[in-house]
């Protein structure tokens, strides 16, 4: 039941995330002018990752799109592959975790499958909220940069009488939904690997191939190369065995891929 | 056709009140930013306030501030201007002015103007 | 505030002649947004209201006469009447529309010779 719930809780709060990582993409307010100096501009100007907008005060928009690809910084590029990069693997995720869904039966999906798919798209989660907060992380820098750069130039060569105001630009809104979705999203990931684990059949229950021997049963167990850490007296990889009687059931039962994970 | 015609001028004593009224027909007033400009007997233009279309934004001068209001009845396509604490140097032509949508924050479109003299 | 100045004054010029009044601003009027300048020019004729003619320092309101032609960048602006006529004797004003307050130049009177 928890498992469940932990899986059904990551899988909202992922799709909340992803559905902020989308909605900060297409917001055009990523920059904002930085009215410190002049709270009452009648000309409001504000920036996104696709288009720059205008805001007067007679109520009248006007947006223009960057139609060129070449002439953008190469930061703004990347913040854009960022995010892109971020929904994707998110819609994908998104995609898997719904079929991974412990509430949703398909046809005969055993657990493990469930299992491995809950991962994955844990995984993926987990990458999308980091390229969205990596994303919008950099904007943020390059914000940051640029406002000192102009802060530096609008107090130098004023000596005469006519002053030419450079627009300096601070955080959007944009900016804090995508921190936000970002972090949502890695949660949401998080939580599904944490599923996941509840998910997966516990060692003590994994299936092993019995060989019959004439003598005695000697059962080979998957999973016996246990991976050594190099710090105990176990510096070498051992071959398990336990001897026994197996069921028919186990003679035909293999074991999964997610028991090598 | 666009209209404003503007009410309510007078003469006053310095410290009184007075409110004036800007009638708008011929037009979507909701959706305009409306302004009110003064000229003083000098003949120099004065912008003194203006209101945004919802009315959420409001911008005065500073040597108006604190003592006129403006405001606006959309439902009633009305501009108004509540002058309190008047003093002489406010005696001027008070104009209603439209602020055009895709004038870049110019006036397109002023009423005849109501005059206001303050004196004792 | 912006201030804008006007020059000259008052100017007298011969009908069919260049009519050509300067404004400039303490602060620059253009918007590196949308790369437009926010000036506006007005004409007001006795016991009249002023009637705006041209807007973001270049552009034609409609219905004025293309004989008025604004121009200019950041803070010096240029209204041009390139052949005066009769109707066009009146007091003509520049209008800072960037920043609040919407300041005003203090107007040039435009007379025949």
């Known amino acids: 039941m928890a498992v469940t719930a932990c899986q059904g809780l990551g899988f909202v709060v992922s799709l909340i995330g992803i559905a902020g990582i989308i909605a900060a993409t297409c917001m055009d307010q990523w920059s904002t002018q930085d009215l410190y100096n002049n709270p009452v501009t009648a000309v409001f100007n504000y920036q996104g990752l696709w288009r720059s907008c205008v805001r007067e005060s007679s109520g009248f928009t006007e947006c223009r799109g960057y139609f060129t690809l070449l002439g953008l910084p190469a930061m703004l590029q990347a913040v854009r592959a960022l995010m892109i990069v971020g929904i994707v693997l998110g819609a994908i995720g998104l995609l898997v975790s719904i079929f991974a869904l412990k509430c949703i039966r398909i046809g005969s999906m055993e657990d493990s499958a469930k299992a491995n798919m809950t991962l994955t798209s844990g995984i993926m989660f987990i990458v999308s909220g980091l390229c969205a907060i990596a994303g919008v992380s950099v904007f943020a820098n390059m914000l940051v940069t640029n406002f000192w750069m102009s802060t530096a130039n609008m107090y130098t060569g004023m000596g005469g009488m006519v002053q030419t105001v450079q627009t300096r630009y601070t955080f959007g809104a944009a900016l804090f939904v995508g921190w936000v979705a970002g972090g949502l999203t890695l949660i949401g990931g998080v939580m599904m690997c944490i599923a996941c684990r509840g998910l997966a059949p516990e060692e003590t229950n994994y299936k092993a191939v019995s060989y019959h021997a004439s003598g005695h049963s000697v059962a080979y167990k998957p999973g016996g190369f246990k991976a050594s850490t190099g710090f105990g007296s176990n510096t070498k990889n051992k071959k398990i065995y336990d001897g026994g009687a197996r069921t028919e059931d186990e003679v035909q039962s293999y074991p999964s891929k997610h028991d090598y994970v | 056709e666009v209209m404003l015609v503007e009410s309510g001028g007078g003469v006053v004593q310095p410290g009184g009140s007075l409110r004036l009224s800007c009638a708008a027909s011929?037009?979507?007033?909701?959706?305009?930013?409306m302004s009110w400009v003064r000229q003083t007997p000098e003949k120099r233009l004065e912008w003194v306030a203006t209101i945004v279309g919802g009315g959420g934004y409001t911008y005065y001068l500073d040597s108006v501030k604190g003592r006129f209001t403006i405001s606006r009845d959309n439902a009633k396509n009305t501009l108004y201007l509540q002058m309190n604490s008047l003093r002489t140097e406010d005696t001027a032509l008070y104009y209603c002015?439209?602020?055009?949508?895709?004038?870049?924050?110019?006036?397109?479109?002023w009423g005849q103007g109501t005059l206001i003299t303050v004196s004792s | 505030d912006i201030v804008m100045t006007q020059s000259p004054d008052s100017l007298a010029v011969s009908l069919g002649e260049r009519a050509t009044i300067n404004c400039k601003s303490s602060q620059s009027l253009f918007n590196s947004g949308n790369q437009k300048n926010y000036l506006a020019w007005y004409q007001q004729k006795p016991g009249q209201p002023p009637k705006l003619l041209i807007y973001g320092a270049s552009t034609r309101e409609s219905g004025v006469p293309d004989r008025f032609t604004g121009s200019g960048f950041g803070t010096d602006f240029t209204l041009t009447i390139s052949s005066l006529q009769a109707e066009d004797v009146a007091v003509y004003y520049c209008?800072?529309?960037?920043?609040?307050?919407?300041?005003f130049g203090a107007g040039t009177k435009l007379e025949i010779k």
């Open positions: 209008q800072n529309d960037h920043t609040y307050p919407l300041t």
């Open positions: 011929g037009f979507t007033f909701s959706t305009y930013t």
């Open positions: 002015a439209r602020m055009g949508l895709t004038q870049r924050n110019a006036l397109d479109y």
